[in-house]
C-alpha cells in the first residue's frame, strides 16, 4: 500500500473521523489538505486499496491571489447506505510531485440489530412430508442465534438452543406460517413469515380397471391430503403418439391433454369415446381446498381392438344325404376391429359339443359319417377378431333337405372326413 | 343431436378474405379436434385444416400454409377458418368436420353442409 | 406428406355385384388411421370405415375395410342401387390429412 514519506512535512490537516452505526445509515468522511501551487487530486483509499468508484466531492479554496499561493483543499467520501461491505479502515491519498501522501485513518463499523442473509420462503409441500426451511442473520455484533416460530409459536426454549440455519420438518398435515427471530447484542430482528400450504400426496397406483375398445376405466389410490379432504381429481388423457407423421418428416407438436374431472370418491374414472385399438397416456392429480398434488407420470394404455358386438346373421344348416350344409353371413353388428375368421360349433342329443375354425369362409359343408339319422343336431356360429369371439349365434336345428329346396348359392368346401370332425354315433 | 352449421361464404375478389364460422351443438365440443375440408366443384376432397382440443396446436395442407388461419372459441361451441389472400383456386365448397372419437383428428364422422366460398373478379 | 392414390378412378358394375376399391398410400400410414367415406351429389361425404377395418355406426354389413401399412381395401359384397356414388379413402395418422383422388362407383 503507499506510503507517505517523512522528507517532507504531510499536507493533511484534517485526517477522516470514525463512522459506527446500523445498516442503511448514511455518512460522510471528510479530509483537509493544505498545498502550495496547483491543488492535486484526492484519492481514497479502503483498507489500502484504491477506492476507483467512490463517491466523493473535492473543493479547492485559494488562500491567495497568485496560483502559487496556498490551497485548502477538502474531499468528502459520502457513504449512502451502510452494508457489511463498506466497513474498513478509510485514508486519503494525494500525489504531491514524486512523493506521495497519506491521511491517518479513520474506520466504519457496522453495529446494530442483526441482518438477514437468507428468509424462509413461501412453498408447498405435499402431506407428511419431510422438507426444510432456511434461515442465516449475521451481525456485527456476532454471535447471532436464531429461534425458529411455527405459527407464532417458539420451536425452542431460548436462542441459539434449537435449529440455527436449517430447520428440517418431517411433515405437515396443515397449512402453516414458518418465521425465525434473529438475537444480538443489539436486539431482536424477524424474518417474513413463510407460508407453507399443504397440498395432498399425489396419487399412486394408477392403473387400469377394465378396457374397450372405445373406453377406459381407470382408479388410482389418493395420496394423503392432511385435514383438507379431496375435492375432487383431475384425469388428463393425449394420443401417446399423437397421430405423429414420423415417415411423414415433421412430427406434429404435441397436442393438449384432454381433461375429464372425477368425483371423490370413488377414484375411479371412466374415459369413453376413445379410438379402438390406439394407444395413449394419462396421468391424474388430485386436488383438496389448497390446491392440486402434482401429476402421477405418464402411464401408457392401449384400447384394445374388439369382439365382434354381433353374431354372424342368417345362418342355415341343411343336411342332403351324408353332407350338412351350413352357411352364413358376416355380423351386421360393429366388428370393433379386423374380422380373422369364423368358429362354428355343433352338438348332437348326448354328445359332446365339437368346435371348428372355418376361417374366413361363409360356409362349410360336413361330410357326415354313417346312414343313421342324426338326432337334435345343432349348429352355432360366431365371428371373431383378433380381441376374441363375439356372441354366438343362437343354435340352429339342422335340417333335412327336401326336393325342390334351393341348394346353397355358393359352392361348399367340403370338410376332410378327419376323426377330429367325425361324428362316430351315426 | 350432433349438427354443424357452416356460415359466412359468398363472393369475394382475389386477394381478398373471407372468415368462416362453425356452430356446433349436440356434444362436448371442447374435447374434440376439428377439421375444416374442402371440395372444388366437381372435384375430390382436400383437407385443409384441423385444430386440436384447446386450439393450441394447428395443422394447413401446404395449399394453404401461410394465409389461412383456423382457430376456435371452446367457450361459443364455434370454430372458424380466417382466409386471407385468396386466389381463384380456393373456390370451394368448405365444410367444417367433427371426428368421431376424443383425442384423434379424425375419421370425420360428422359433416356440416358446406359454405361456398367462389374467389372471382 | 402422404398421398394416397385410390383405384380404380371409375368402376363400372352392377347391382349384385362385388366391388372392389383401393387404396394406396406412398409412406406407411400410422396406426392404420385411415377411413373411407362415400359421397352422393350434392351432399356431404358419409363416414363408412375407420382404423381401415371397423365400421361406423349404421353402415350396412356389405361394407368391409381391410388393409394395413400402405396398402387397403374397402369391398362391398353386394352392390344394391343405393350404393352407387364416388368413394374417398383419407389418412390420419400424419399431418397433413390427405385424401385420395376418390373412386367413381357407377352402374353398368
Known amino acids: 500500500a503507499p506510503r507517505g514519506t517523512q522528507a517532507e512535512e504531510s499536507p493533511f490537516v484534517g485526517n477522516p473521523g470514525n463512522i459506527t452505526g446500523a445498516r442503511g445509515l448514511t455518512g460522510t468522511l471528510r479530509c483537509q489538505l493544505q498545498v502550495q501551487g496547483e491543488p492535486p487530486e484526492v484519492h481514497w483509499l479502503r483498507d489500502g486499496q484504491i477506492l476507483e468508484l467512490a463517491d466523493s466531492t473535492q473543493t479547492q479554496v485559494p488562500l491567495g491571489e497568485d496560483e502559487q499561493d496556498d490551497w485548502i483543499v477538502v474531499s468528502q467520501l459520502r457513504i449512502t447506505s451502510l452494508q457489511l461491505s463498506d466497513t474498513g479502515q478509510y485514508q486519503c491519498l494525494v500525489f504531491l510531485g514524486h512523493q506521495t501522501f497519506v491521511s491517518q485513518p479513520g474506520y466504519v463499523g457496522l453495529e446494530g440489530l442483526p441482518y438477514f442473509l437468507e428468509e424462509p420462503e413461501d412453498r408447498t409441500v405435499a402431506a407428511n412430508t419431510p422438507f426444510n426451511l432456511s434461515c442465516q442473520a449475521q451481525g456485527p455484533p456476532e454471535p447471532v442465534d436464531l429461534l425458529w416460530l411455527q405459527d407464532a409459536v417458539p420451536l425452542a426454549t431460548a436462542p441459539g438452543h434449537g435449529p440455527q440455519r436449517s430447520l428440517h420438518v418431517p411433515g405437515l398435515n396443515k397449512t402453516s406460517s414458518f418465521s425465525c427471530e434473529a438475537h444480538n447484542a443489539k436486539g431482536v430482528t424477524t424474518s417474513r413469515t413463510a407460508t407453507i400450504t399443504v397440498l395432498p400426496q399425489q396419487p399412486r397406483n394408477l392403473h387400469l380397471v377394465s378396457r374397450q375398445p372405445t373406453e377406459l376405466e381407470v382408479a388410482w389410490t389418493p395420496g394423503l391430503s392432511g385435514i383438507y379432504p379431496l375435492t375432487h381429481c383431475t384425469l388428463q388423457a393425449v394420443l401417446s403418439d399423437d397421430g405423429m407423421g414420423i415417415q411423414a418428416g415433421e412430427p406434429d407438436p404435441p397436442e393438449e391433454p384432454l381433461t375429464s374431472q372425477a368425483s371423490v370418491p370413488p377414484h375411479q374414472l371412466r374415459l369413453g369415446s376413445l379410438h379402438p385399438h390406439t394407444p395413449y397416456h394419462i396421468r391424474v392429480a388430485c386436488t383438496s381446498s389448497q390446491g392440486p398434488s402434482s401429476w402421477t407420470h405418464w402411464l401408457p394404455v392401449e384400447t384394445p381392438e374388439g369382439v365382434p358386438l354381433g353374431p354372424p346373421e342368417n345362418i342355415s344348416a341343411t343336411r342332403n344325404g351324408s353332407q350338412a350344409f351350413v352357411h352364413w353371413q358376416e355380423p351386421r353388428a360393429p366388428l370393433q376391429g379386423t374380422l380373422l375368421g369364423y368358429r362354428l360349433a355343433y352338438q348332437g342329443q348326448d354328445t359332446p359339443e365339437v368346435l371348428m375354425d372355418i376361417g374366413l369362409r361363409q360356409e362349410v359343408t360336413l361330410e357326415l359319417q354313417g346312414d343313421g339319422s342324426v338326432s337334435n343336431l345343432t349348429v352355432c356360429v360366431a365371428a371373431y377378431t383378433a380381441a376374441g369371439d363375439g356372441p354366438w349365434s343362437l343354435p340352429v336345428p339342422l335340417e333335412a333337405w327336401r326336393p325342390g329346396q334351393a341348394q346353397p348359392v355358393h359352392q361348399l368346401v367340403k370338410e376332410p372326413s378327419t376323426p377330429a370332425f367325425s361324428w362316430p354315433w351315426w | 343431436e350432433v349438427q354443424l352449421l357452416d356460415s359466412g361464404g359468398g363472393l369475394v375478389q382475389p386477394g381478398g378474405s373471407l372468415r368462416l364460422s362453425c356452430a356446433a351443438s349436440?356434444?362436448?365440443?371442447?374435447?374434440?379436434?376439428m377439421s375444416w375440408v374442402r371440395q372444388a366443384p366437381g372435384k375430390g376432397l382436400e383437407w385443409v385444416s384441423a385444430?386440436?382440443?384447446?386450439?393450441?396446436?394447428?395443422y394447413y395442407a401446404d395449399s394453404v400454409k401461410g394465409r389461412f388461419t383456423i382457430s376456435r372459441d371452446n367457450s361459443k361451441n364455434t370454430l372458424y377458418l380466417q382466409m386471407n389472400s385468396l386466389r381463384a383456386a380456393d373456390t370451394a365448397v368448405y365444410y367444417c368436420?367433427?371426428?368421431?372419437?376424443?383425442?384423434?383428428?379424425?375419421?370425420?364422422?360428422?359433416w356440416g353442409q358446406g359454405a361456398l366460398v367462389t374467389v372471382s373478379s | 406428406e402422404i398421398v394416397l392414390t385410390q383405384s380404380p378412378g371409375t368402376l363400372s358394375l352392377s347391382p349384385g355385384e362385388r366391388a372392389t376399391l383401393s387404396c394406396r398410400a406412398s409412406?406407411?400410414?400410422?396406426?392404420?388411421?385411415l377411413a373411407w367415406y362415400q359421397q352422393k351429389p350434392g351432399q356431404a361425404p358419409r363416414l363408412l370405415i375407420y382404423?381401415?377395418?371397423s365400421r361406423a355406426t349404421g353402415i350396412p354389413d356389405r361394407f368391409s375395410g381391410s388393409g394395413s401399412g400402405t396398402d387397403f381395401t374397402l369391398t362391398i359384397s353386394r352392390l344394391e342401387p343405393e350404393d352407387f356414388a364416388v368413394y374417398y379413402c383419407?389418412?390420419?395418422?400424419?399431418?397433413?390429412?390427405?385424401f385420395g383422388q376418390g373412386t367413381k362407383l357407377e352402374i353398368k
Open positions: 409412406q406407411s400410414v400410422s396406426n392404420s388411421y
Open positions: 382404423g381401415a377395418s
Open positions: 368436420a367433427k371426428p368421431g372419437f376424443i383425442l384423434v383428428r379424425g375419421p370425420l364422422d360428422y
Open positions: 349436440g356434444f362436448t365440443f371442447s374435447s374434440y379436434a
Open positions: 383419407q389418412q390420419y395418422g400424419s399431418s397433413p390429412y390427405t
Open positions: 385444430i386440436s382440443i384447446g386450439g393450441g396446436n394447428a
